[in-house]
């Protein structure tokens, strides 16, 4: 089976990853790929190999090891073990199982100080399943009136997905229909003439553009949404840049 | 385990509705879509809509649109289908499906003056 | 709507042999899943996704393709796989399926 991970190379790829420095120059631990390490959600098919890599470096050489749920990860805790590939600053693991599922931290760490970066692994049994969207996306946003602000939705589907962004609206001045439903507002969505549908950009925004915005995902088996609040301040007041929160879970489905 | 139990065969003439079920055990109804599709005779198999239960979102095929209706109660995990102005050429078997691999056993709608 | 047309529409085959079905989409397609159906009843899933065996689905059967051509591949028949086959598309309102190829014994 196909190795999923963060980059579609092999170990014997000929990347730099293990990088030597010189001692008179010593340093904390940092990445040295960070491209490599974006996708942090791996939603992968049962018997399906994982490799997750943390490509770093440093002065001393550091150090990796592997958390699993923020525990010691030990290769008795599943079957068949896992390989380490410390020159690649990776992780494999063979043909997955649901039980594999959860959190992997690989901990970077020298004499003057430690990084850690996690991801989150979700084995997908093998059957259809619902569309899975990365937690903490869209995320919420602010601006002031006239910016211009984007929303992302990160979506995970191995059937064909049908994505809308939407927003609740009133009629009249109710939110909600006589069949207690909401009434909605369907912004963008995907389909021939639509590129992109996983971003929702808003140009120019006014401060009836403020609320709520919903990112719904849909394939034959099932949905998924996520929102996101967009606040709208008054031009002499500057956004205030949101703290960014690691979510846990790292997918919704 | 998975099941979806349909509502038995129905005969019914020109021009009257017919209203089938399907109850849902074994996982989250709410949480997938429910699909109809039929066979006639001999034939093969026609798409006819899908609701999903949490938020009653329905996508119809154009073809069936007016005279199929389909609904669901999710206190009971149970989804229908109901079509009225009903034609010879209705006749099938009925089949209700879900998460894309569980199949109701079918129920035998016959329109017959 | 986007049509698929299976061929063959029947096919007579022996027990050992090797078979393939085709579905070719009118509009190209990211992916393709495959029923059997037996007389009286339901169809029943063999591969989603174009080339990912539903569970408890023999090896022997395969799914592959891409855009308009996609191919249903059961490596050695065996007696229990005479029945109708259809392909199905999940992509784009209204689903439809293919007529059907309908497997005989020769």
């Known amino acids: 089976d196909a190795i999923s991970s963060g980059d579609d190379e092999d170990d014997t790829d000929s990347s730099e990853d293990f990088v030597s420095e010189n001692r008179s120059n010593q340093r904390a631990p940092y990445w040295t790929n960070t491209e490599k390490m974006e996708k942090r959600l791996h939603a992968v098919p049962a018997a399906n190999t994982v490799k997750f890599r943390c490509p770093a470096g440093g002065n001393p050489t550091p150090t990796m090891r592997w958390l699993k749920n923020g525990k010691e990860f030990k290769q008795e805790h599943r079957i068949g073990g896992y390989k380490v590939r410390n020159q690649h600053w990776s992780l494999i693991m063979e043909s997955v199982v649901p039980s594999d599922k959860g959190n992997y931290t690989c901990l970077v760490e020298n004499e003057y100080g430690s990084i850690n970066h996690t991801y989150h692994l979700d084995v997908v049994e093998r059957s259809p399943h619902r569309p899975i969207l990365q937690a903490g996306l869209p995320a919420n946003a602010s601006t002031v009136v006239g910016g211009d602000v984007e929303f992302v939705c990160k979506v995970y589907s191995d059937a064909q997905p049908h994505i809308q962004w939407i927003k609740h609206v009133e009629k009249n001045g109710s939110k909600y229909g006589p069949d207690g439903l909401p009434y909605l507002k369907v912004l963008k969505h995907s389909g021939i003439n639509s590129s992109n549908a996983e971003v929702l950009a808003l140009f120019n925004v006014t401060e009836m553009d403020a609320g709520e915005y919903i990112c719904k995902v849909s394939n034959y088996i099932g949905q998924a949404n996520q929102s996101a609040w967009l606040t709208v301040l008054p031009k002499q007041q500057a956004p205030v840049r949101e703290k960014e929160i690691t979510a846990s879970p790292d997918y919704l489905e | 385990e998975v099941q979806l139990v349909q509502s038995g065969a129905e005969v019914k003439k020109p021009g009257a509705s017919v209203k089938v079920s399907c109850k849902a055990s074994?996982?989250?109804?709410?949480?997938?879509?429910m699909h109809w599709v039929r066979q006639a005779p001999g034939q093969g198999l026609e798409w006819m809509g899908a609701?999903?239960?949490?938020?009653?979102?329905?996508n119809y095929n154009q073809k069936f649109k007016g005279r199929v209706t389909l609904t669901r109660d999710t206190s009971i995990s149970t989804a229908y289908m109901e079509l009225s102005r009903l034609r010879s050429d209705d006749t099938a078997v009925y089949y209700c499906t879900s998460r894309g691999d569980y199949w109701g056993q079918g129920t035998t709608v016959t329109v017959s003056s | 709507a986007i049509q698929l047309t299976q061929s063959p529409s029947s096919l007579s085959a022996s027990v050992g042999d090797r078979v393939t079905i085709t579905c070719s989409a009118s509009?190209?397609?990211?992916?393709m899943s495959w029923y059997q159906q037996k007389p009286g009843k339901a169809p029943k899933l063999l591969i989603y996704d174009t080339s990912n065996l539903a569970s408890g689905v023999p090896s022997r059967f395969s799914g592959s393709g891409s855009g308009t051509d996609f191919t249903l591949t059961i490596s050695s028949l065996q007696p229990e796989d005479f029945a109708t086959y259809y392909c199905?598309?999940?992509?784009?309102?209204?689903?439809?399926f293919g007529q059907g190829t309908k497997l005989e014994i020769k």
């Open positions: 074994g996982y989250t109804f709410t949480n997938y879509w």
């Open positions: 509009s190209g397609l990211s992916y």
């Open positions: 609701i999903y239960p949490e938020n009653r979102d329905i």
């Open positions: 199905q598309q999940w992509s784009s309102y209204p689903y439809t």
